[in-house]
Interface confidence: low
């Protein structure tokens, strides 16, 4: 009598979740009388996938009709495939009996699901940081599978290499998570820098998933201060510009101390940006040369994104014996840019 | 309709021996992963024993070497063969239906008691 | 063994409200978590399988979530008929093994 075979003619078959899969099956003989059942994993803890001979399976139909008496073919249809559903299936031949003897087992087919990666999250710093400073980017996606998957970042479209990928768990698993940590040197060019982590994997057919952060969340460029004296107006007015430039973000608070004595306090707002994404403050301040009898010292203190102050000072000169009311008494610039006694930057 | 039915259960001293039985109707008992599962008097529930649709058996650890399951295909019932019986054994016994899918259970027996006292 | 700790061990709610209990399993179970309803008395009925697949006839006030450790099942709208004591289960590897039970009962 001719040995009786249980043939599963694909070693592997591979399914897109959401999708059916047809696990094929068939014996060689219909002799001698018994079920096929079909199951996912071996030994004694595998789990029944389909019973051909009676039971409810709401996702597993058979490919024919196993009633009829002269069929040879035991293949089924798994719809709606999930991640969990991966495993080794395994068509098994029983003898009639009481209880049912296992006569042979195919050799099984491994269903390997292709679960899409999750649109990749960028995240960046929690607080800003200045030009010349690293910053780290995390970049995560979820739940794909197979494990094989590429991970890139890129800054303002050139590749990044201070990189580190993780891809978990490390061992077998139905679907699996990448993250990803970037280094990334901040210039003062940056406030219109993007970051992108690209997400290639089989399932997406060469259209990888792409995640952005803008480099404009992550980044405080400080400003420059410059102090200068206009020439001497008629009325004895000395103007005086504070020019605060090239700072980002715009949130920003500048005031004018003379002596010492607060003079007044302005916010900047609704600044024009520059090409580069910062932001350019002019404030002005009139002295009144005839009401001070002693040099006056000005001070432009200007506090940006909570930071500590940076103060830039002026002296504007008040001659010694000033002539009459409405003459022509000159305000000397010293010419020297005092620095803030706690470190502000010139 | 589907149904179990449990019998057997009674009054049994220490070291006594007890036989349970399953009647199951509506469906082929042997088609199905069968498990019996007790419950002692104000606990909760604990898994006993299991016999698969090839006949393969299992048992919880505080059963093993004095429980036999086994099942008579002609009858469609299921057994539980009881011997060196403790008080702790002492309990409501179900007769449990494995679920063809993935053998969660579906289909409960109404139960028999056991009690092991001298 | 796989341990199935369940919370809480009693809960008092009213008719019409909202009720949540968890399961953690000591090892992943992927989603085998079954949940079962039990009348003083009566034997067990089961409600959900695979964690939140309903058996044939529960209404759809049951629903179950959760894979991996962590499961729990809810229930949207009680009435006087749910109070009752639930168990949780799992049955991803022998033994199978039930949660201690949450008894619910009418505040």
């Known amino acids: 009598e001719e040995e009786l075979q249980v043939i599963q003619p694909e070693k592997s078959v591979s399914v897109a979740a959401g999708d059916s899969a047809t696990l094929n099956c068939t014996v060689s003989s219909l002799i001698p009388v018994g079920p096929i059942q079909w199951f996912r994993g071996a030994g004694p803890g595998r789990e029944l996938i389909y019973n051909l001979k009676e039971g409810h399976f709401p996702r597993v139909t058979a490919v024919s009709d196993p009633t009829k008496r002269n069929n040879m073919d035991f293949s089924i249809r798994i719809s709606n495939i999930t991640p969990a559903d991966a495993g080794t299936y395994y068509c098994v031949k029983f003898r009639k009996g009481s209880p049912d003897v296992e006569l042979k087992s195919g050799a099984g087919t491994e269903l390997s699901v292709r679960a899409k990666p999750s649109a990749p999250v960028v995240s960046g710093p929690a607080v800003r940081a200045t030009a010349e400073h690293t910053v780290s980017f995390t970049c995560e996606s979820h739940g794909f599978s197979p494990r094989d998957i590429t991970l890139k970042w890129f800054k303002n479209g050139n590749e990044l290499s201070d990189v580190q990928t993780n891809v978990d768990p490390a061992g077998k698993s139905v679907s699996y998570s990448i993250r990803s940590t970037a280094r990334v040197l901040l210039t003062r060019r940056d406030v219109h820098s993007q970051v992108i982590c690209e997400v290639a994997h089989v399932t997406l057919q060469g259209d990888p998933l792409r995640g952005t952060a803008n480099l404009s969340e992550a980044i405080r460029v400080p400003p420059f201060l410059e102090v200068t004296q206009q020439s001497m107006r008629a009325d004895n007015q000395v103007n005086v510009t504070c020019q605060v430039t090239k700072f980002y973000p715009q949130r920003l608070q500048l005031t004018w101390l003379e002596n010492g004595n607060v003079s007044r306090t302005e916010m900047a707002s609704a600044l024009p940006e520059n090409k580069d994404g910062t932001y350019n403050w002019t404030s002005w301040l009139l002295v009144n040369v005839s009401a001070h009898r002693d040099d006056v010292k000005l001070t432009c203190q200007v506090e940006h994104d909570g930071q500590p102050a940076v103060n830039k000072s002026f002296s504007v000169k008040v001659s010694a014996h000033p002539k009459e009311q409405g003459s022509n008494t000159a305000a000397e610039n010293t010419g020297t840019n005092e620095r803030n006694i706690y470190g502000g930057s010139g | 309709e589907v149904q179990l039915v449990e019998s057997g259960g009674g009054l049994v001293q220490p070291g006594g021996s007890l036989r349970l039985s399953c009647a199951a109707s509506?469906?082929?008992?042997?088609?199905?992963?069968m498990h019996w599962v007790r419950q002692a008097p104000g606990k909760g529930l604990e898994w006993v024993s299991a016999i698969g649709t090839a006949g393969d058996t299992y048992y919880t650890g505080s059963v093993k070497g004095r429980f036999t399951i086994s099942r008579e295909n002609a009858k469609n019932s299921l057994y539980l063969q009881m011997n060196s019986l403790r008080a702790a054994d002492t309990a409501v016994y179900y007769c449990?239906?494995?679920?063809?899918?993935?053998?969660?259970?579906?289909?409960w027996g109404q139960g028999t008691m056991v009690t092991v006292s001298s | 063994d796989i341990q199935m700790t369940q919370s809480p061990s009693s809960l008092s709610a009213s008719v019409g409200d909202r009720v949540t209990i968890t399961c953690r399993a000591s090892?992943?179970?992927?989603?085998?978590a079954a949940w079962f309803q039990q009348k003083p008395g009566k034997a067990p009925k089961s409600l959900i399988y695979t964690a939140s697949s309903l058996h044939s006839g529960v209404p759809s006030k049951f629903s179950g979530s959760g894979s991996g450790t962590d499961f729990t099942l809810t229930i949207s709208s009680l009435q006087p008929e749910d109070f009752a004591t639930y168990y949780c289960q799992q049955y991803v590897s022998y033994p199978y093994t039930f949660g201690q039970g949450t008894k619910l009962e009418i505040k």
């Open positions: 090892q992943g179970i992927n989603n085998y």
């Open positions: 509506g469906f082929t008992l042997s088609s199905y992963d």
């Open positions: 449990v239906r494995g679920g063809v899918w993935d053998d969660a259970f579906d289909i």
